[in-house]
Structure formats: C-alpha cells, structure tokens
C-alpha cells in the first residue's frame, strides 16, 4: 500500500486527500487541484504540488558561478497543467490566454506569447544550483561535514540517490549544493532532482511538504545550520530561448 | 565522556517481538547526531539496522522494514529497538551506537541475544 | 546495496612489519569532498572501534600507525609497524548510500 494504513495518510504529501477506497480497501490518496493518485511512498511531482498549493485556501563560490543559461523561478507561483504522469506540460497558459514554455521544473524558458506559442518538448532541467547563505555561527562549519550531512538529508529526508548529488561547495557563510541528473541517468523509479529540490525549498521555507513531520532541523555535529536565503539556479538541457529585450533588461 | 549501554532480554521465542534499550549518558541525544542499532551475527558479519536522529527521524535498512521499529524517550535520554516476528537467524549480539556524520565514534558493549523456543 | 570485499580474509605478520588490508567497495562511495569508508578494529568480546574515518582522517587517541588510503571503490588500511596489541579483526564500513554496509572482515595474527 503505499499511504499510511493505520491512519490512512500521506507521509510524502499533506496536501492530499486520503480514503481507504483502493484496492482491498487499502488507502489511497489524493492530491489536492488535481484530484491525481499519488504514490505515498515517494516524492510528489512539482507540478501536483503547486497545483494542490494554488488550490488550496490563502492565508489573508570556489563556489560555483551560475552559467548565463541559468534560469531563476521569477515568475512566483502559478496554476500549472500537468499531464497524466504528473510532469508539467511544455507548455502554460494563464486565464487571460498568455502562454509560455516550461522545462521540467516548470519555470518558464520563453518569452511570453499568445495561444499561437509552440512549445514541441519540455526540456529537462538536468543540473541545478541551490545557493545558499546561513546565518551567523560561532565558527565556520567544517566543509567535510557539511557535505556528509546534506547528502544525508538529500538521501534520507528526500530520497534522492547520492550519485545525483554532484557537489556541496562552501566559503561561509554560502552553501552551494549541485543537484545533476540527465535524462538518461534517471531510472524507474528514482526521484527527480527538480522535486528534491522543491521539497528542499518548501523546508528552508519552514513551509513542510512532509505529513505531520516537523520542521526541517538540520545540524552539523548537532550545530543547528540555520538558513537566512535561498536562491534556486536551474539549467536546462537545452539553453532557454528569451529575446534579446530581456536579457538587456 | 560520552557512553552507550544496551539492555534487554538475553532469550526471546521465535515469532515474539525483541525489545532492547540504549541508555545514553554524556551527551543529550536531542543535542545532535543520530543514534544507531547495529548487530554482529555468530559468524561476526556486520549489519546495520537503523537510526533514530536527534529530531526523532528513523531511518531503517530496507531488509528489516516491515519489522523494526526505533523510538526514543528524551527524558530518561534512551533509545530503544523494536524487532517484529524474531526468527532463530535473529540470533545476534546487538550494539547501539553514534553516528557522528555517517561513522560510527561510540559504541556501547553489546547484548547477546538468543532467539529460540 | 553497496557490497564491500575485504581482502584477505586472515592475515599473519611479524612484529615490526608492515600489514595491509584492503576494501572494494561494489560502487563508489565519494562525493565531491568526501570518501565516505571507514575502519573499525574489534577485538574479542568487545565492540567495534573507530580508527579511521572517511579513508585517511585518524580517530582522536589512534596510534599513527594506523593509516588509510584510497579512493572511489578501492580502499587500504596500513599496519605499520605491527605491534603484538593489533591482533584483531578489521571491518570497513561505507556510508555513501543506505543502507550502510561493512566488509565481512580481515582476522590479523602475529606469525
């Protein structure tokens, strides 16, 4: 079964709606916007998670330089459409008709058009650059640490195989974790670096995606390591295609 | 100092449920680190079986998941091992031990456990 | 799983000699900074103890004799020189994936 059976609900996604209607009456789940099944067992898509977030009631460098291809989420938050698998579809449109092309993480990679816009892939994002700055320790961290505690946290918390956990950089108080998996790297089965990435973003936000878990509390040699900002770099396997307009911007 | 000391029954029945505890002492096990079970087989083949993290996390080796189970209780600074449906290859010498960042520094001294009708 | 090969599986030196132990790792077990291979030493009827962690950083109160080398899959720990005090099994232990996976151990005697 892959929800909680004793209580019927989603450990990986507390932004479903759980019943005992599955199979054998084992307990199925959810998610929220879409109305999609999910596997408990896993990491919810991005795409399913923003949906279920734009649904829900609202609340009244030796670290590493992001190449110029490097893409940033500026466009916020927005009413994705998914295909059946739960990924995004190439390409968005909000209500007003405006469209534009997304890679896998969903971030837009072209200039905005009309319903005329073609999008004819989604194009993986296959490395991303999470940067970090942490607040005010008595001492730096030790860099050896530091690396063995967030591959564990990306290992265990998100389930992401070390292997696509490509480096941890660190000149204090910045963190630069490299997130990287082609297309052909990823198996059945694995979690996509884009949805680690995105559960990752919603802890530091103290914004848990997880079922009744607390708060991330990450510690290095039990030093809290508290996180003051985040910037999300994403490369795609095919540079983005914006105007010149906006590169000059 | 920091010190692990494991306790727990000696002789469990096949099919009943083995229950060992870790007492820590010299440093709170909500402070940091994680806090781990491990067993020594008759033929000294090592096996980790889980942890349970200062934040109360667990993390389990996939062979034993449908049966372990490794909870704590901060105000007696212990930790304890829970073994569903104990067979004879059960039969191992248990160790609790710290995992500093991802090695293991502290161990306690073991218990011998004995699964047989 | 990761799958760790220790060689040989017993192994006698004289005293004042060199004793080398090795460890394949089924996969690699780095990271960018890190070497995620550890040593333990287990005498009989005590636990396992730490002395080397990630491949070649010597535990606090471990004689400099002991020292670890290695990197990706192919790991050593050196004996050198061997006193009477080292008889004693050593197990590696990866910690790059879960679940965390030791070698099946290296019996040291004194010839």
């Known amino acids: 079964h892959t929800a909680a059976q004793d209580n019927c609900t989603c450990p990986t996604n507390k932004m479903t709606v759980c019943s005992p209607d599955g199979p054998g009456g084992r307990c199925q789940c959810r998610a929220l916007g879409s109305g999609m099944a999910v596997d408990c067992s896993t990491l919810t898509s991005k795409c399913l998670l923003l949906k279920a977030r734009m649904s829900a009631p609202k609340n009244a460098r030796t670290l590493v330089r992001p190449s110029e291809h490097a893409l940033v989420d500026n466009d916020g938050l927005y009413d994705p459409d998914c295909d059946p698998e739960g990924r995004f579809k190439a390409r968005q449109c909000n209500q007003t008709s405006v469209c534009w092309c997304v890679n896998s993480v969903g971030v837009r990679r072209t200039d905005k058009g009309d319903l005329s816009l073609r999008c004819d892939e989604l194009v993986r994002t296959h490395h991303i650059l999470i940067d970090l700055r942490h607040r005010p320790t008595a001492g730096a961290f030790n860099h050896s640490d530091l690396d063995a505690e967030l591959r564990r946290l990306f290992r265990e918390r998100y389930r992401l195989h070390p292997k696509f956990v490509a480096a941890v950089h660190y000149e204090q108080p910045t963190i630069q974790i490299e997130l990287r998996q082609n297309t052909s790297q990823k198996a059945a089965g694995d979690v996509d670096i884009g949805d680690a990435a995105y559960y990752f973003e919603r802890d530091i936000k103290g914004e848990s995606l997880f079922q009744g878990r607390g708060g991330l509390d990450l510690r290095v040699r039990g030093e809290p390591l508290q996180v003051e900002r985040t910037l999300i770099y994403y490369l795609d396997e095919i540079p983005p295609k914006f105007s010149m307009k906006r590169l000059t911007a | 100092d920091v010190q692990l000391q494991e306790s727990g029954p000696g002789l469990v029945k096949p099919s009943q449920s083995l229950s060992l505890t870790c007492s820590v002492t010299g440093y709170s096990i909500t402070s940091g680190y994680y806090w781990n079970w491990i067993r020594q087989f008759p033929g000294n083949k090592l096996e980790w079986m889980g942890y349970i993290s200062y934040d109360g996390r667990n993390n389990y080796n996939p062979s034993l998941k449908n049966r372990i189970s490794i909870t704590r209780d901060t105000s007696e600074n212990q930790f304890f091992l829970k073994l569903n449906s104990v067979t004879p290859e059960d039969t191992a010498t248990y160790y609790c031990a710290r995992d500093t960042t991802a090695y293991f520094d502290y161990w306690g001294q073991g218990t011998t456990l004995t699964v047989s009708s | 799983d990761i799958v760790l090969t220790q060689s040989p599986p017993s192994l006698a030196v004289s005293l004042g000699q060199r004793a080398t132990i090795s460890c394949r790792a089924s996969?690699?077990?780095?990271?960018?900074?890190?070497?995620?291979m550890h040593w333990y030493q287990q005498k009989p009827g005590q636990p396992p103890k730490l002395l080397i962690y990630r491949a070649s950083n010597l535990e606090s109160g471990i004689p400099a004799r002991f020292s670890g080398s290695g990197s990706r899959t192919d790991f050593t720990l050196t004996i050198n020189p061997v006193e009477a005090d080292d008889v004693a099994t050593y197990y590696c232990q990866q910690s790059n994936e879960d679940p965390y996976t030791f070698g099946g151990g290296t019996k040291l005697e004194i010839k």
């Open positions: 996969e690699s077990v780095d990271s960018s900074v890190n070497r995620f």
